[in-house]
Interface confidence: low
């Protein structure tokens, strides 16, 4: 018969014959022959291959480097790579999550609109009129100005986006 020019799914063409690919989690040791099947071996402890393949070496699992703020989210298997994520309080600097950065803080005059997650940074917003923030914080929202009226006091010093109002006693009219 004519030698094949194409092979079925999960096969590959070598030396004019179709050999079975190695299944995920295994690497190729030797190609098939007219008389023998493809020989495959399982990947080692910290290795993986995630597709049907003819690779002679497995890939190393990703290392989640704690010095980059990373930790293991999902341990790798012989068929899957390790998935890294950031330590609590940090978020990935890229989609591949190769390193992390500490969540940023919102400066005075700004409050936290959205608290950071493992993949997104803190979102800050300017404190609108009637609100203030006098600290740099990764968690605090803008606080409303104190209502002097509800305390039977008057505004002695107006508030800003960074400072609260200062309340003081009402001037008593003398009889």
């Amino acid at each position: 018969p004519e030698p094949p020019t194409a092979c079925r799914e999960k096969q590959y063409l070598i030396n004019s014959q179709c050999c079975s690919l190695c299944q995920p989690g295994q690497k190729l040791v030797s190609d098939c022959t007219e008389f023998t099947e493809t020989e495959c071996l399982p990947c080692g402890e910290s290795e993986f291959l995630d597709t049907w393949n003819r690779e002679t070496h497995c890939h190393q699992h990703k290392y989640c480097d704690p010095n980059l703020g990373l930790r293991v989210q999902q341990k790798g298997t012989s068929e899957t790579d390790t998935i890294c994520t950031c330590e609590e309080g940090w978020h990935c600097t890229s989609e591949a999550c190769e390193s992390c950065v500490l969540h940023r803080s919102c400066s005075p005059g700004f409050g936290v609109k959205q608290i950071a997650t493992g993949v997104s940074d803190t979102i800050c917003e300017p404190c609108p009129v009637g609100f203030f923030s006098n600290v740099s914080s990764a968690f605090e929202k803008c606080h409303p100005w104190t209502s002097c009226e509800t305390k039977d006091l008057v505004v002695q010093q107006a508030g800003t986006n960074k400072t609260d109002v200062v309340c003081g006693p009402q001037d008593r009219l003398r009889a």
Epitope: G89, S99, L102, H103, S105, S137, E140
Partner: nanobody
Framework: EVQLLESGGGLVQPGGSLRLSCAAS????????MTWVRQAPGKGLEWVSA????????YYADSVKGRFTVSRDNSKNTLYLQMNSLRAEDTAVYYC????????????WGQGTLVTVSS
């Protein structure tokens, strides 16, 4: 000019305690995230701990969790690292750094203080 000056290092027995301080100047300390890193003899830098500007977020490497406590006094422009239950493997030069990345990419570094844990 930004300056970071660590102090408090020394020789301590295993199981003992030390408190490191880092005096900061030349920038608005209360607006800056701060980090402690260390370098053991003949080894690379290791991130130890970090703290948010207001101290409302503190973070630790697994190797020191439950033993070390980071804190800060913004009124004194000072960062602290309380180290308890010290082990031989904690022997290192400890540096404070201004910045929010747990690697070498800090804005500014201190000169370091040596902690030796030995009996």
């Amino acid at each position: 000019e930004v300056q970071l000056l660590e102090s408090g290092g020394g020789l301590v027995q295993p199981g003992g305690s030390l408190r490191l301080s880092c005096a900061a100047s030349g920038f608005t300390f209360g607006d800056a995230a701060m980090t402690w890193v260390r370098q053991a003899p003949g080894k690379g830098l290791e991130w130890v701990s970090a703290i948010q500007p207001m101290g409302d977020g503190t973070y630790y490497a697994d190797s020191v969790k439950g033993r070390f406590t980071v804190s800060r006094d913004n009124s004194k422009n000072t960062l602290y690292l309380q180290m308890n239950s010290l082990r031989a493997e904690d022997t290192a030069v400890y540096y404070c750094a201004k910045g929010r990345i747990p690697t070498l990419q800090f804005d500014y570094w201190g000169q370091g203080t040596l902690v030796t844990v030995s009996s």
